[in-house]
Amino acid sequence: WELTILHTNDVHSRLEQTSEDSSKCVNASRCMGGVARLFTKVQQIRRAEPNVLLLDAGDQYQGTIWFTVYKGAEVAHFMNALRYDAMALGNHEFDNGVEGLIEPLLKEAKFPILSANIKAKGPLASQISGLYLPYKVLPVGDEVVGIVGYTSKETPFLSNPGTNLVFEDEITALQPEVDKLKTLNVNKIIALGHSGFETDKLIAQKVRGVDVVVGGHSNTFLYTGNPPSKEVPAGKYPFIVTSDDGRKVPVVQAYAFGKYLGYLKIEFDERGNVISSHGNPILLNSSIPEDPSIKADINKWRIKLDNYSTQELGKTIVYLDGSSQSCRFRECNMGNLICDAMINNNLRHADEMFWNHVSMCILNGGGIRSPIDERNNGTITWENLAAVLPFGGTFDLVQLKGSTLKKAFEHSVHRYGQSTGEFLQVGGIHVVYDLSRKPGDRVVKLDVLCTKCRVPSYDPLKMDEIYKVILPNFLANGGDGFQMIKDELLRHDSGDQDINVVSTYISKMKVIYPAVEGRIK
């Protein structure tokens, strides 16, 4: 019996087609992805093949103005239109709190939403009861397939799930649910979830009875053969893990941003064992036409977005200096504003020991592309912020050793004076450079804001200590020459859309007046 699994993950509100790098589509003939194009390909496969499941491994939420405006209603609407069979909850599904998950998505989805390792307690237990499930049994042709969901246990550090959801260890939570499916005579089981490729592989290895793992969170691109675009494969598709009980378990993921549709064919024997598995992600490029009815629906929903981008978010009473003459040479108040917004967006998970889990921000000056003039009545709009941060990136959470941070700050000024983009703007950091010294030895003082303290203060950076830092995904991926970050990071979790982070902060503050205050000397 053959099953076709179509899968997406980390779509991050790319409802419209995008450019090859998943930013705003400029030249339509070279654009990719989007739900209208995805629908064309999905329908084509559904017509051609008998047993097809369309699955999503989480993080539909967050990433473009679509999410900012529609707050998840767009996800439910278009996933319903595409007729997804199931979805696993990702960490970003909690970005607007539990209410922001229940109202627009859980109440509106016409498909099951899954997570076995999220347990509700207190008043939330009854409120959310039945709206998401640990598993679902789906009939496919003449057979049944069990789908069990999981979500990153780091979600409380990455999003806003509140205090009434407990995120258990994935493997511990999955095993009893898989066992339950076995007692229901379900012998074909897919683990669908959002914890990253390393955890996906562990689930394949450790959870008895799981036949296939469909993952997300780490934006992993797997491919067999010559890759069709810029993404470099992290391994073959599917990636085969040998389980502890000796089975060959295929693990898949489909990069991110709706650029690819994962396509996996699995052959099962009559006892539900995987005999063979093969496939590849399908690049959703312009050779696949956009479905006209979905496209028309997208255009209808788009109207509200255009109105939103010119509305006032808040006011500035000072000039927001985002000029390259400032931000690539010295501390600039636009850099301070953005870093403050980045930290504010990550205020969560305080306890008796820690006032917050992260206090530091770094931001490449070259990523700041425009100033905002306060003389336009002080008004700040989404459109203004899109000029400052035009690349459609995210502000991510990484864990780095102090020694890596030191290298990053040396890199920041290794060729100072040439108006290059690697000069770092900061938050929660005080850095002093001596530019008379030779490159690679210019950082003379590097103090960082403590987190394990009741009164935050600046302490010297410790080389062997592990620090959490918020930074643009561009830097986490080694951009602007920050190879040491990419090579040495100990953990990387993708965060919220850059413009959204700053716009939320400005809306919260209402009036802003960031200063140059001696963070960089």
Epitope: R83, E103, K107, A109, K110, F111, S126, Q127, G130, L131
Partner: antibody, heavy 117, light 106 residues
């Protein structure tokens, strides 16, 4: 367990209004939409409309839009359906039903509304 | 508005017979179709949604299939307790019920 308990039978004159209630228990009332459906004697089922109890948003069947009002009281976990300008063809059993995955899972026991002069 | 045409309007079959009811939508409804059972004097009961997904506790003799505009509900082996009227419901765009099929035992 989920229960939807509706108000008792009503007899109304043509031109009058009727308000039927549906009290939910066994789940959080505001977490699921509530549908209203009617069934004339010996006839099939006809969808009237639905309400999202948490925010009060409604969707109506075009046929009833001008005469029906769906409301809710979250403090008592009760949904209401009011139908005005009653005529004899409105004689029917009126049901509330909870929405899940877009469809209707749990139904109330029904309320017979008789319109007669 | 989406119209649903359900057939037959009634049928009579023997215990153990295979019974099939069809529903045709006036346009593609994306498999967003449910089947309900209503016994005399009772409220409808959801059996199947999304064209083919059973509700927990529903006997396996009930099944649904179909896609696009055409859907089928099957009782593989009719039992005395299956005497009822069966309705389809589309929920792709708002909601429309089929006219119903009354199932009787010969």
């Amino acid at each position: 367990q989920v229960q939807l308990v509706q108000s008792g039978a009503e007899v109304k004159k043509p031109g009058a209004s009727v308000k039927v209630s549906c009290k939910a228990s066994g789940y959080t009332f505001t977490s699921y939409w509530m549908h209203w459906v009617r069934q004339a004697p010996g006839q099939g089922l006809e969808w009237i409309g639905e309400i999202n109890p948490s925010i009060g948003r409604t969707n109506y069947n075009e046929k009833f839009k001008s005469r029906v009002t769906l409301t809710r009281d979250t403090s008592t976990s009760t949904a209401y359906m009011e139908l005005s300008s009653l005529r004899s063809e409105d004689t029917a059993v009126y049901y509330c039903a909870r929405r899940v995955y877009g469809t209707m899972d749990y139904w109330g026991q029904g309320t017979l509304v008789t319109v007669s002069s | 508005d989406i119209q649903m045409t359900q057939s037959p309007s009634s049928l009579s079959a023997s215990v153990g017979d295979r019974v099939t009811i069809t529903c045709k939508a006036s346009q593609d409804i994306n498999s967003y179709l449910s089947w309900f059972q209503q016994k005399p004097g009772k409220s409808p009961k959801l059996l199947i949604y999304r064209a083919n997904i059973w509700v927990d506790g529903v006997p396996s003799r009930f099944s649904g299939s179909g896609s696009g505009q055409d859907y089928t509900f099957t009782i593989s082996s009719l039992q005395p307790e299956d005497i009822a009227t069966y309705y389809c419901l589309q929920y792709d765009e708002l909601y429309t019920f089929g006219q119903g099929t009354k199932v009787e035992i010969k």
